[in-house]
């Protein structure tokens, strides 16, 4: 998987009036990395691993960047026409990636009230608008404003591609996120289900990267997909991931079932506790 930095900013308006403040989250390699603390008006690392990325450096640069981006997004929302009364949101998601062959990709996406209406490839500066007519109208609003704005001043919209990649490289230089492998901790539990049945759950936690195979086997053969329940692979807040798989089995047959885990070239099997 490529290394990635993903900015997610949201601003709100009420009855056409743009509200002060903004919401911001930054993900590094798919993990929650930074959050903008509105009380303290600061960018804050999400968990110990995020703090380790910059070590003892301050987060002033990140605070300044997020504040500037939030201000720009508020201005963009202020230029969206025909805002209905009530609460509305404008969300900007910006992603840049560095692939293993050192090629790069950058994109920016705008959502109004949760609906995608404008995307831009930041390398080619090519815009894409969904077919829906509402999206076309919203996109016209925003593109007209961005064009005007770019004429007046060199905003972050022009420098975003370069800035995002520069930040991503800076974070990668710390070594904390560079192709590390953290093996999962695997834990199998059982719980009572219906008469004569038990539910067995296999949990894998604190692993990185996120790609993992976790499945139940009976007599060494993987169970069919539809006899198992799967959890999403989710960040656990420490720069690692967690997931689970469960199935229902007959009481007394526990010894026939094992949880099979494969991660980063390593694999293991885990029995059901008696």
């Amino acid at each position: 998987e490529p290394h990635s930095l993903r900015y997610n900013l949201t601003v709100l308006s009420w009855d056409g009036s743009v509200q002060s403040g903004f919401l911001a989250e930054v993900h590094l390699d798919g993990q929650p990395f930074l959050r903008y603390d509105r009380q303290k008006c600061r960018a804050k690392p999400q968990g110990q691993w995020a703090e380790d990325v910059l070590g003892n450096k301050t987060w002033d640069r990140e605070t300044r960047d997020l504040t500037g981006n939030g201000k720009d997004l508020r201005m963009t929302l202020a230029h969206i026409k025909d805002q209905k009364e009530g609460l509305h949101s404008l969300q900007e998601i910006r992603v840049c990636e560095i692939h293993e062959d050192n090629s790069t990709r950058s994109s920016q996406h705008f959502y109004y009230d949760g609906e995608l209406f404008l995307s831009q490839n930041l390398e080619t500066e090519e815009w894409t608008v969904p077919q829906s007519s509402r999206a076309q109208t919203l996109a016209m609003n925003v593109r007209n404003f961005l064009k005007e704005d770019a004429m007046k001043t060199k905003t972050h919209y022009h420098a975003m591609h370069a800035d995002c990649l520069q930040e991503l490289r800076r974070y990668l230089e710390s070594g904390v996120v560079l192709r590390r492998t953290v093996p999962p901790m695997v834990n199998v539990t059982r719980s009572e289900a219906s008469e004569g049945n038990i539910t067995v759950t296999c949990r894998a936690s604190s692993f990185y990267p996120r790609n993992i195979i976790l499945t139940w086997r009976q007599d060494g053969v993987s169970l069919s997909h539809d006899t198992q329940q799967w959890g999403d692979v989710l960040p656990d807040g420490n720069g690692t991931y967690q997931t689970w798989v469960a199935t229902r089995i007959c009481r007394g047959e526990e010894q026939r079932f094992t949880c099979y885990m494969e991660h980063s070239g390593n694999h293991s099997t885990h029995p059901v506790p008696s």
Partner: antibody, heavy 118, light 107 residues
Framework: QVTLKESGPGILKPSQTLSLTCSFS??????????VGWIRQPSGKGLEWLAH???????YYNPSLKSQLTISKDTSRNQVFLKITSVDTADTATYYC??????????WGQGTTLTVSS | DIVMTQSPATLSVTLGDRVSLSCRAS??????LHWYQQKSHESPRLLIK???QSISGIPSRFSGSGSGSDFTLSINSVEPEDVGVYYC?????????FGSGTKLEIK
């Protein structure tokens, strides 16, 4: 109290340029979210939206007439202008200006009538 | 462009009747639909905004409903001053198209 009033030449010959003025009071086009649009109505027919200008000088035109239309504003004088080049008899209509806020036209002028005739 | 279709073209009613005017959009416009009333020799007047939201100063006998592509304007008990043409308008997306109108007349 919001009021809008249109003024125009009344009669034009084909191929001439129509210049319309909308003078308004009770609101300002410097207020965020505010817009003024032009709508026309041939006698006994329906309404056709022509053009729109916003507080931030963003302008929208009806695509079917875009090449003929120019909308502009003078914020300090509370006026919006519409020019239609090379009119013909199909442009004979009553022309309205209307305030647009939050997505709808909430106040309309009384209209000005244009007759195009050779 | 979004095409707005109104029906019927003309509606002849008796005073006191409850009437319904229909407006259909050629594609979904959520609730971004506005109704206007135009009396003879007058300019249009906003009646209902966003499909069902009332406008101050408009009599409560006027109400709107619908979402997506089908909308209805209802007049609870028709009065003589309700005679005129009723237009629906797409407020969802550019260009802002109007329906062709429904003419309301008294029998």
């Amino acid at each position: 109290q919001v009021t809008l009033k249109e003024s125009g030449p009344g009669i034009l010959k084909p191929s001439q340029t129509l210049s319309l003025t909308c003078s308004f009071s009770g609101f300002s086009l410097s207020t965020s979210g505010m817009g003024v649009g032009w709508i026309r109505q041939p006698s006994g027919k329906g309404l056709e939206w022509l053009a729109h200008i916003w507080w931030d000088d963003d302008r929208y035109y009806n695509p079917s007439l875009k090449s003929q239309l120019t909308i502009s504003k003078d914020t300090s004088r509370n006026q919006v202008f519409l020019k239609i080049t090379s009119v013909d008899t199909a442009d004979t209509a009553t022309y309205y200006c209307a305030r647009r806020l939050n997505g709808y036209f909430d106040y309309w002028g009384q209209g000005t009538t244009l007759t195009v005739s050779s | 462009d979004i095409v707005m279709t109104q029906s019927p073209a003309t509606l002849s009613v008796t005073l006191g009747d409850r009437v319904s005017l229909s407006c259909r959009a050629s594609q979904s416009i959520s609730d971004y639909l506005h109704w206007y009333q135009q009396k003879s020799h007058e300019s249009p007047r906003l009646l209902i905004k966003y499909a069902s939201q009332s406008i101050s100063g408009i009599p409560s006998r006027f109400s709107g409903s619908g979402s997506g592509s089908d909308f209805t304007l209802s007049i609870n008990s028709v009065e003589p001053e309700d005679v005129g043409v009723y237009y629906c308008q797409n407020g969802h997306s550019f260009p802002f198209t109007f329906g062709s109108g429904t003419k309301l007349e008294i029998k």
